[in-house]
Amino acid sequence: DSSKWNIEHPGTIYAWEGACVWVPCTYRVLDGALETFILFHNPEYNQNMSKFEGTRLYESTKDGKVPSGQKRVQFLGNKINNNCTLSIHPVHVNDSGQLGLRMVSKTEKWMERIHLNVSERPFPPRIQLPPKLQESQEVTLTCLLNFSCYGYQIQLQWLLEGVPMRQAAVTSTSLSTKSVFTRSELKFSPQWSHHGKIVTCELHDVDGKVLSEDMVQLNVKHTPKLTIEVTPNETIVRKGDSVTMTCKVNSSNPEYTTVSWLKDGIPLKEQNTLMLTLHEVTKSQTGRYCCRVSNDVGPATSEKVFLQVQYAPEPSRVQISQSPAVEGSEVNFLCISPANPLPTNYTWYHNGKEVQGRTEKQFQIQKILPWHAGTYSCEAENILGIGERGPGTELDVQYPPKKVTMVIENPTPIREGDTVTLSCNYSSSNPIVNHYEWRPRGAWEEPSLGVLKIQNIGWNNTAVACAACNNWCSWASPVTLNVLYAPRGVRVRKIKPLSEIHSGNSVSLQCDFSSSHPKEVQFFWEKNGSLLGKESQLNFDSISPEDAGSYSCWVNNSIGQTASKAWTLEVLYAPRRLRVSMSQGNQVMEGKTATLTCESDANPPVYSYAWFDWNNQSLPYSGRMLRLEPVKVQHSGAYWCQGTNRVGKGHSPLITLTVYYSPQTIGRR
């Protein structure tokens, strides 16, 4: 009853003469354990005898003995783990057929058939390829051999066009109840050059002997493979020559469908054949040419051919790094003259005259000067000739005004108060002078550009400078105006004594002035309108109070004269010329008032008076006036006064006061 038995094995086992077979086998029986196992070769069922007949290759009994088994057949299974694996080593062609596994348990019997296919010679492995091979896309190549046996070592080797492949193959074997095989897998990136090539998988024995092989031809899909040829075979041509380029399709799978040509990456119109002809080339046809050919895989572009059209230098032009350029700056000139090959020699011209020693494309002037201004042109030369000299480029050199000078337009000499006209001149300037500056700055009139009018010129307008200005100002050296003026700052100065003047002192007065132009001067001293002297100093050997007064000095030069402020000379002296005066006369009647006044001449004024009688007796009065009220006859006598200031003392002569009796007194007597 088949439902009671479950036996697993590969179904068919393949081998060849002299190899071995390994039959992986497992079983399961529903009721009870396996008691008997017999391996038949091509068993047949005898209906009459109700049993299988055939060659018994192996037989197991209850006690596990093999009564008459062939030594080359081994039962590798056991009843404990339900294994029914067996091997035949070596195997022969006449072993081909069916192997019958007769299994008997206590209650059940079963015959399991396994096909054994033993060929005379080793059979070839099978190469398995993916449905599509495309260049540079990695695929796995599989070589499969439906054989594997523990007792017989084999090896699978890959070859490409008979040469072992360098890539590492991964070999795997299977000896399971599902399948028996040896497999080699190879990762492979086909290139277009592999198209049509033969890949072989060889079966080798343990000694490396080739037992069998399988071959396949690779069908590698790839874009067209191109080369480009130029005739004549030189890619450097001269203007006017003709050139043919041919696009060769060395390989294409599948066949190419379209052709186009590109120059510098841009498609050329109406050029769709494998041949491109350029007639009478021009310099514009210089460039990188390639052909593009497409098939179903995609487009391919050939390597580029650099076509150089040679021509003599074209009319030149000069590029200047800066114009206008500032004097002293660096200026670079570049000669631009398209040519192929590049010019090897240049000639530079400045205002039409050749610049010696400058033969390069770039001409540099490190410090530009005004005389470098002008037109610069150049000629370029290559192997095909000398190019035309272009019109040139103008260099403008800008600089501050040069050689700035000042001129006094007035007739000289200039006097204080005159109107003076100055002009500011320069030799050259670029750009033109657009304004002028003057120092010192003043509220002066500029009647025209570069002319300064100073009206009522001051005595102290000594130096004036001008600047002529464009983008920069250039200053002239200052011009000394040499303004003539009458002496200034005239004053009287006391030289000695250093302190106050006392009567009798030696006194010197100095007539000072701060400036005078011209320097030659004369002096005059004046007191109260009277001329005293003509020296710079006025000297008093012994000053007297009479010398006090208001003094002035005058200083004059050829331009005019200047007086000092009046200067007061003060002489200090002790009281002098003292006298006593009596307002009512020197005879006074008794009982009346007698007023004596001490009159004096003193500088500074008297600050203290003293009165004395005829006996030189000091009287108790200290004022300027002595009042005797009422006066008595006894008061008659001589009196004198003394005056004191900080310089000294002075006293008056005696004055006699006569007091007479009144009529009443006389009447009483």
Epitope: V355, G357, E360, Q366, K367, L369, P370, W371
Partner: antibody, heavy 124, light 110 residues
């Protein structure tokens, strides 16, 4: 006739500042294209360019000595000055000043006229 | 800093042509190095001969000429004279400074 004359202290001590004066005649540093440079020559050795100054106050210095050098000019007095700070015995040399000019009609400069030199000794 | 190299000494005879060269350690000498040539005669008498690679200074005899030969600046004395016996220094400009060569002693054998 163009002449240049160098003057200096003769002898000075290490760490002092060397002051050199170049007095010239026959040209002016207010004229376009004129410059004055300083060059020195240690005894028995080659020339070493130190600095130069142009009419437009453009100054150039030897990079190896730049931090120690100062060049200046007094156009009105026809003089160019060079100061070398923190001198050492290695600064012992003959110092020359030379006119650097771009003559009229030329595009390049020349060290055309040189002074006779002034000897400077740096000694402790 | 660049190094400027010259021949240490050259000998010539009157009427002969002699060429002195000036090499830069930074590469080829170009017109942008504004090569200058200076002559030193006994007693430290210096004279500028050539500026801007190949321009003779005013008043310099025509037998002195400057040029570029290969990657070097050159001074050629065509028809040397005994008074040309001197030390010749070249100076090269490096964008903002000059560097002098060590000098070539030219001997004119009379």
């Amino acid at each position: 006739q163009v002449t240049l004359k160098e003057s200096g202290p003769g002898i000075l001590q290490p760490s002092q500042t060397l002051s050199l004066t170049c007095s010239f005649s026959g040209f002016s540093l207010s004229t376009s294209g004129m410059g004055v440079g300083w060059i020195r020559q240690p005894s028995g050795k080659g020339l070493e360019w130190l600095a130069h100054i142009w009419w437009d106050d453009d100054e150039y210095y030897n990079p190896a000595l730049k931090s120690r050098l100062t060049i200046s000019k007094d156009t009105s007095k026809n003089q160019v000055f060079l100061k070398i700070a923190n001198v050492d015995t290695a600064d012992t040399a003959t110092y020359y000043c030379a006119r650097i000019s771009i003559p009229y009609g030329y595009y390049d400069w020349f060290f055309d006229v040189w002074g006779t030199g002034t000897t400077v000794t740096v000694s402790a | 800093q660049a190094v400027v190299t010259q021949e240490s000494a050259l000998t010539t005879s009157p009427g002969e042509t002699v060429t002195l060269t000036c090499r830069s350690s930074t590469g080829a000498v170009t017109t942008r190095n504004y090569a200058n040539w200076v002559q030193e005669k006994p007693d430290h008498l210096f004279t500028g001969l050539i500026g801007g690679t190949n321009n003779r200074a005013p008043g310099v005899p025509a037998r002195f000429s400057g040029s570029l030969i290969g990657d070097k600046a050159a001074l050629t004395i065509t028809g040397a004279q005994t008074e040309d016996e001197a030390i010749y220094f070249c100076a090269l400009w490096y964008s903002n400074h000059f560097i002098f060569g060590s000098g070539t002693k030219v001997t004119v054998l009379g």
